[in-house]
Amino acid sequence: EKPVYELQVQKSVTVQEGLCVLVPCSFSYPWRSWYSSPPLYVYWFRDGEIPYYAEVVATNNPDRRVKPETQGRFRLLGDVQKKNCSLSIGDARMEDTGSYFFRVERGRDVKYSYQQNKLNLEVTALIEKPDIHFLEPLESGRPTRLSCSLPGSCEAGPPLTFSWTGNALSPLDPETTRSSELTLTPRPEDHGTNLTCQMKRQGAQVTTERTVQLNVSYAPQTITIFRNGIALEILQNTSYLPVLEGQALRLLCDAPSNPPAHLSWFQGSPALNATPISNTGILELRRVRSAEEGGFTCRAQHPLGFLQIFLNLSVYSLPQLLGPSCSWEAEGLHCRCSFRARPAPSLCWRLEEKPLEGNSSQGSFKVNSSSAGPWANSSLILHGGLSSDLKVSCKAWNIYGSQSGSVLLLQGRSNLGTGVVPAAL
């Protein structure tokens, strides 16, 4: 069998500064089993070096001097007895760039440098960024372990130093932020903020960093109801809104949360399984009615919990007046006025612009009031005949406005002219 020296190794390898690379390698050399068995030594040298005098970059021979600059960084990996010459290069440095050759020695007969199969190593600038690992999603209030590691880095060379920065870390002990791992308990306000891990090799100028934007899952903490872009005040999960009857109303409910809560509106104070009247945060009423006094509830449903706010509508209205209308009856002139308002209005009668209070002591007039449904009625009875043309007025008012109506009673005429005079405050 013809003696053969063969080396299988890639021609060139590129590694980023500060990272590691494993260069697979296998070799063969002529050896007869009946030979004696001196130890097998293998070496990696810088190209151009003379094997007999030069310091090696890596070897399995404990008696050979290793270059101080590659000590602990260039290592033989694998079993040389099984003809494995794989080379591990750690914490690569720019000055490592160059060619390397492999040499085998065994006893007096085997001494061979594989000059035809050189390994060309190129160290480039570090562009690799570290990876920040954590279990997603981050949940508000739940402690989560984060770790920072650089793909392609290894234990070789001086230790790595870490530093963490970000708003979410403000309460942490500075020492904690120098480890490759940290425990974070995120808050809702940390959502969308940046967290940066920076890595540096001690004694080297090589630094790299990665920034991630935190996606913190949190349930709604507050609900805000807006009317015309203005937030309503909320006390004990209830908001009070005075609104004019007949007015159109558009309300927007907002509950910051992540992921966004499902917003819906309900009539009154709903059961958990109630049907919404809007499946969004928008509630539109074409017209507020007195029936709306029951109010509405905005509910924010979220995987981490739900929140709801009751909107108590206080419906008010300007007085609406029907009348007065007058007719002659046995006991005298009978005038009626109907009015409707929220809150209930006050009403007064006037005769020739003079107020008629209660019932007259002389019995010349009598006032009666009653209510039925949303309407209240008041009647005025004037005893005796008319001496001249008379103007009878009734006026209703509440804190929001007033309305008055009058009738002109013409002496000797059966038809009575009426007129309504609205007056808003």
Epitope: I277, I282, E284, R286, R289, S290, A291, P374
Partner: antibody, heavy 122, light 113 residues
Framework: QAYLQQSGPELVKPGASVKVSCKAS????????MYWVKQSHGKSLEWIGY????????RYNQKFKGKATLTVDKSSSTAFMHLNSLTSEDSAVYYC???????????????WGQGTLVTVSA | DIQMTQTPSSLAVSVGEKVTLSCKSS????????????LAWYQQKPGQSPKLLIY???TRESGVPDRFAGSGSGTDFTLTISSVKAEDLAVYYC?????????FGSGTELEIK
């Protein structure tokens, strides 16, 4: 509970007109729109229009413009539909129906009157 | 105008059977502001006024038995009667109230075998 009571059947001659009434009870008439629907014999339903009882505003299906006029009398809580220039095509059952919640001008018909049969025949 | 198409026009079923009635609209009935489908289902028994069963495509009107269920969104809607009873003999109409003029389907007549 809302209840709508419609006027009785009408037999009218072609060219004449008819006024169908719908009295509302159990709720405030002005709080809800009142819809009117036509159902010809053995046929589906057709929306005629609605009246906003609060302000008297109306909206009609183009097909019934000029044929139907909707009005309301708040004092008696009654809605009316006046049909004019009647032909045999107008023979049908006419329903009044109240909307559901009264929040939107586009709502379902929650309560129906019993229907008024109008027969147009010479 | 929005066209409402109901299928089948009639069907005969036995008591206890499950029934599915279909209604398709010529355009989407989903209102973006409140994410509700503006569709209603009515039941009209012989000689009676229509009665509301379902509104907003899936909300059962109070007092309607829970064997009636509405589903669907956009343009395709379904009324399901989980176990038909003899009293369910009627014509069932779907109606859109998304845009004027409001329109009804031509109805599905449910007969009991």
């Amino acid at each position: 509970q809302a209840y709508l009571q419609q006027s009785g059947p009408e037999l009218v001659k072609p060219g004449a007109s008819v006024k169908v009434s719908c009295k509302a009870s159990g709720y405030s008439l002005t709080d809800y729109n009142m819809y009117w629907v036509k159902q010809s014999h053995g046929k589906s339903l057709e929306w005629i229009g609605y009246i906003d009882s609060y302000n008297g505003g109306t909206r009609y299906n183009q097909k019934f413009k000029g044929k139907a006029t909707l009005t309301v009398d708040k004092s008696s809580s009654t809605a009316f539909m006046h049909l004019n220039s009647l032909t045999s095509e107008d023979s049908a059952v006419y329903y009044c129906a109240r909307e559901g919640f009264g929040y939107d001008d586009r709502e379902w018909f929650a309560y129906w009157g019993q229907g008024t049969l109008v027969t147009v025949s010479a | 105008d929005i066209q409402m198409t109901q299928t089948p026009s009639s069907l005969a079923v036995s008591v206890g059977e499950k029934v599915t009635l279909s209604c398709k609209s010529s355009q989407s009935l989903l209102y973006s502001t409140n994410q509700m489908n503006f569709l209603a289902w009515y039941q009209q028994k012989p000689g009676q006024s229509p009665k509301l069963l379902i509104y907003w495509a899936s909300t059962r009107e109070s007092g309607v038995p829970d064997r009636f269920a509405g589903s669907g969104s956009g343009t395709d809607f379904t009324l399901t009667i989980s176990s038909v009873k003899a009293e369910d003999l009627a014509v069932y109409y779907c109606q859109q109230f998304y845009s004027y003029p409001f329109t009804f389907g031509s109805g599905t007549e449910l007969e009991i075998k």
